[in-house]
Structures are given as C-alpha cells and as structure tokens.
Amino acid sequence: KKEDGESTAPTARPKVLRCKCHHHCPEDSVNNICSTDGYCFTMIEEDDSGTPVVTSGCLGLEGSDFQCRDTPIPHQRRSIECCTERNECNKDLHPTLPPLKDRDFVDGPIHHK
C-alpha cells in the first residue's frame, strides 16, 4: 500500500507557462497574464496607417515553431520574438521593425523605373 503523499512517478506533461499579454489576451487570461503549453511572444507590426503596434501573449505548442520563425511577409513590416525560459519572459523581448526596403515606399499603382 502506498503511503498518503506518495505516488508513482509523474507522467511527462507540459508545465504551464505564464506570459504577459497585451492586445492579444485570450478569454481565460487574468490581469493581462495568459497560460500556455508553448511560448511567450512579443510582436511589433505596422497597422494600416503605418503606426507600429506592439502585441504580446501566448502561443500554443502546436504550430508555434512556425509562428516564432520570423519569416518576412511581402508588403508587411513585422517582427516577432518568442521565449520559454521563464514565466513572463516576453516582458524582456523588444523586437524591432525590419528596415524599409525601396519597394516598400511604392504607394499603390505608382511604379518607379
């Protein structure tokens, strides 16, 4: 018989990670803290008017490798950084917008030859 307070070894389960969330808080978040089995992230991107907007929150383990890979998106300036090393680690992430390329100045149908 097992003594009370004694059990067999735990099965491997993900340990919840708490992240700061801003502009990206899920319905279960409390006090701008969300919970995930994956990564914390901070992202900066331009909105439609060209103003930089910083977003932070939680990414689930599934698909987060792809989301955390900062692959360039045509005609969209954005940068994302992810972390898992401690709770609220994304407080210390400060991604910066990639530099403007010449073609990013092209507005609508006007083309420079």
Epitope: G5, E6, S7, A9, P10, R13, P14, K15, V16, R18, P26, E27, D28, S29, V30, S35, D37, G60, R86, N87, E88
Partner: antibody, heavy 117, light 113 residues
Amino acid sequence: QVQLQQPGAELVKPGASVKLSCKASGYTFTSYWMHWVKQRPGQGLEWIGDIDPSDRYTNYNQKFKGKATLTVDTTSSTAYMQLSSLTSEDSAVYYCAISGWDYFDYWGQGTTLTVSS
Amino acid sequence: DIVMTQSPSSLAMSVGQKVTMSCKSSQSLLKSSNQKNYLAWYQQKPGQSPKLLVYFASTRESGVPDRFIGSGSGTDFTLTISSVQAEDLADYFCQQHYNIPLTFGAGTKLELK
C-alpha cells in the same frame, strides 16, 4: 516514486508566524508548479497560491495576499509557505500539491496547523 | 473568481448502484483554442489527502478504476460511478483549472447505505 513530505502538525500562538515545509522527491523539482491548499475541518478546499520552482514566479489568491508567502529552496527540493499574524481562522490542514497544468497530480499528506494560546 | 457549485451535498447509495454527482461553474470552462474543458475531479477519503480522478473534464488519471467517468462541457459537469464499491466512500470535489485563482466546489459526500 513521488513523495511530498509535510510535518504532521504545528501548534502556534495567535499573532505569531509559522513556516510550513513540503519536501519533494521522486521527480524533477523544477518541472512542476508547487501549490498550497487550505482545508478547514468539515469544509471545502481553498487554493492559496502557487510557485514555479524554476524561476520562483508566484501567483496568489487575492484572499491570501499578505497572509501567505511562498518560497522554494531548489537545493533541498523543499517548498515553504509562511503564514503571518495568525488567528484561529488560520487553524486548518494545509496541503502542498504539484501540478503541470493547474490540476493537482500529487498531494502531500497535509500539516494540521492549530492556532491557540 | 469562478464559483463552483456541487450537488447534492451528500448521498447514500448501496454497493453496485450507479452514482451521479453534479458540478456547475459560474462561467464556461471550455477553452476555444483547444476545445478542452478545464475541470478536474478529486476523491478524498476520511483522514487522507485528495486524489486526482479526472482532469480536462473526462480524462481519467492513470490508475483510476474505469467505473469513474467524468463528462460534461461548458458550465455543467458530472462525475458518474457506474457501480459503486465500499471503498468509494469519500468526499468528491470538483475544481476548475481554467484560470487563477483556482477554485473548488464545496464537495459531495458519498455515504453507503
């Protein structure tokens, strides 16, 4: 196997403080959150708070902020809960328990705290 | 805080009977991101610490007899013991693990006739 060892009982005078311990073994101490739960005789269970031993990050139930302080000593794989300004309302069984995702996989046997002069 | 309400507060059953107990939450425990219900059930025998029976509403903990069945979604949950045994005499608590502060129901006491 997982063990969470807690002293059986503590007797403390009103107004004093007490530091309850929970010694963990049988698993990697930093891989699970450590929680503390209060149970008064014949009553339900109340979550006090939790601590992540890997970075000492804590969450507290608002009701126990200022009453309970959670700490860990990773070298000895021991979690502690200090309770301050004790009154008879603090007399209860206090359990430590571990979790991966906020449900309690394993529980200690509990420490019965009696506050009496 | 999420309020958990259990009913009945006690029930007396004979060995072999089917037992059903209810747990209701003041808000939905269903996470849209993964379609899981964040509800756990525990058994506490007299003089012992609680023991995990079910998590995510219906996932039985390893080593728990299959007569214990968790079901439900959203705000309404049920623990069923398909054929109650003498060793099932205990208090049963539900707990939401949807967000902090984690909260428990007041419990259902199972007594044997």
